[in-house]
Interface confidence: medium
Amino acid sequence: VPRWRQQWSGPGTTKRFPETVLARCVKYTEIHPEMRHVDCQSVWDAFKGAFISKHPCNITEEDYQPLMKLGTQTVPCNKILLWSRIKDLAHQFTQVQRDMFTLEDTLLGYLADDLTWCGEFNTSKINYQSCPDWRKDCSNNPVSVFWKTVSRRFAEAACDVVHVMLNGSRSKIFDKNSTFGSVEVHNLQPEKVQTLEAWVIHGGREDSRDLCQDPTIKELESIISKRNIQFSCKNIYRPDKFLQCVKNPEDSSCTSEI
């Protein structure tokens, strides 16, 4: 008799998920010498232990604590780049500006980036058919809880000037419901963080508006100011030129506004 399997609204676990996590861990510990002590098999076991045999709508931050402990990592707290709805450019930036870090430049973020995973209650199987969708099914699913946990820890670790890259092409440049808006903003520590500097990335070439005056940016400024953190904002009118100037800052065209 075929066993009944819960059908969720979201895509199932990424194919070859265990192999992918293990391979990513090995590669990461290889190129980041300070993480070379990490035992990747133990990391996978802790990752698996967070969601296997558990109801995929009943996952807690506590479930991920063994993994968090194994993945403990010190990044320069004054070199943190947060992002919202503009991941690719943020990652391109830290690939060039290698002394700055997004969450996905840390071991745990690197392991899970772009992956989906979930298990089933009372069975050791990974569900490759479907996983809970955050909106349609439940918010306490393995993927959402993971990112909430690591994002909170990442924000808590930040100090001095923290940068955030925001997508100026979206209707809500700052979205209170994004991971940045709902988790990271509220976990920056005012006793450590002096300033949050937003970089608003423009989409259109002819877009010369000052998006730092957008109502959602003003809302972000208000939230941050109430938390006793200073706020500043910059328009990045030409993201392509911005990246080029990060690569070649001595270029004569890089003195003008980007």
């Epitope: 290889e30 010498p33 300070e34 070379r36 002394d99």
Partner: antibody, heavy 120, light 110 residues
Framework: SLEESGGDLVKPGASLTLTCTAS?????????ICWVRQAPGKGLEWIAC???????TYYASWAKGRFTISKTSSTTVTLQMTSLTAADTATYFC???????????????WGPGTLVTVSS | AQVLTQTPSPVSAAVGGTVTINCQAS????????LAWFQQKPGQPPKLLIY???TLASGVPSRFKGSGSGTQFTLTISEVQSDDAATYYC??????????FGGGTEVVVK
């Protein structure tokens, strides 16, 4: 010790494969084996590395595409070079970054080098 | 690309004197201290002098001293001897498995 072989006089456009051989030890899983070159009278230039245990490879941006580093046994690593030009004329060194203890991120073992000359 | 700029070159020193070589990185090196210094003499492979910015390699005289952090590094050779005549290179490691060498500084001993 490390020793390079395969250096030769070749014509522009030719391909060549260099070999790095370890003597007295085999590459541990964390060992990085790399190639560095030095044009006559010029400075050192990093080309590529391979990690013994995973065969993951890392290249200088200029070397991607024309140069391929491979591990062929527990004691040998090769560097395949294609579409050679006069600018590739150099002594090619094999170098090791052991990645043990505090030995990380630098080359503590070098071969004597092998000369590659590209000329018509 | 990561660029390491060495100055000055060449540098001249009298026996018994002191030589200072600077190495400036276009970006912070890995962990702010993944920088090594090498000595190279004609016809020979480079020889490791300093690693982790300031740690003396085995068998290297204490006359050689490395210092610095982030993007600015210095190699100081005190009580220079005629055998110190060579070309000196800095070498950095960057996240992502990237290595880079400085352009080299020739030390001439008078």
């Amino acid at each position: 010790s490390l020793e390079e072989s395969g250096g030769d006089l070749v014509k522009p456009g030719a391909s060549l494969t260099l070999t790095c051989t370890a003597s007295g030890f085999s590459f541990s899983s964390r060992y990085w084996i790399c190639w560095v070159r030095q044009a006559p009278g010029k400075g050192l230039e990093w080309i590529a590395c391979i990690v013994a245990g995973t065969t993951n490879t890392y290249y200088a941006s200029w070397a991607k595409g024309r140069f391929t580093i491979s591990k062929t046994s527990s004691t040998t690593v090769t560097l395949q070079m294609t579409s050679l030009t006069a600018a590739d004329t150099a002594t090619y060194f094999c170098a090791g970054d052991p990645r043990t203890g505090s030995n990380v991120g630098y080359f503590n073992l070098w071969g004597p080098g092998t000369l590659v000359t590209v000329s018509s | 690309a990561q660029v390491l700029t060495q100055t000055p070159s060449p540098v001249s020193a009298a026996v018994g004197g002191t030589v200072t070589i600077n190495c400036q990185a276009s970006q912070s090196v890995y962990n702010n201290n993944y920088l090594a210094w090498f000595q190279q003499k004609p016809g020979q492979p480079p020889k490791l002098l300093i690693y982790s910015a300031s740690t003396l390699a085995s068998g290297v005289p204490s006359r050689f001293k490395g210092s610095g952090s982030g993007t600015q590094f210095t190699l100081t050779i005190s009580e220079v001897q005629s055998d110190d005549a060579a070309t000196y290179y800095c070498q950095a490691y960057y996240s992502g498995g990237i290595y880079a060498f400085g352009g080299g500084t020739e030390v001439v001993v008078k």
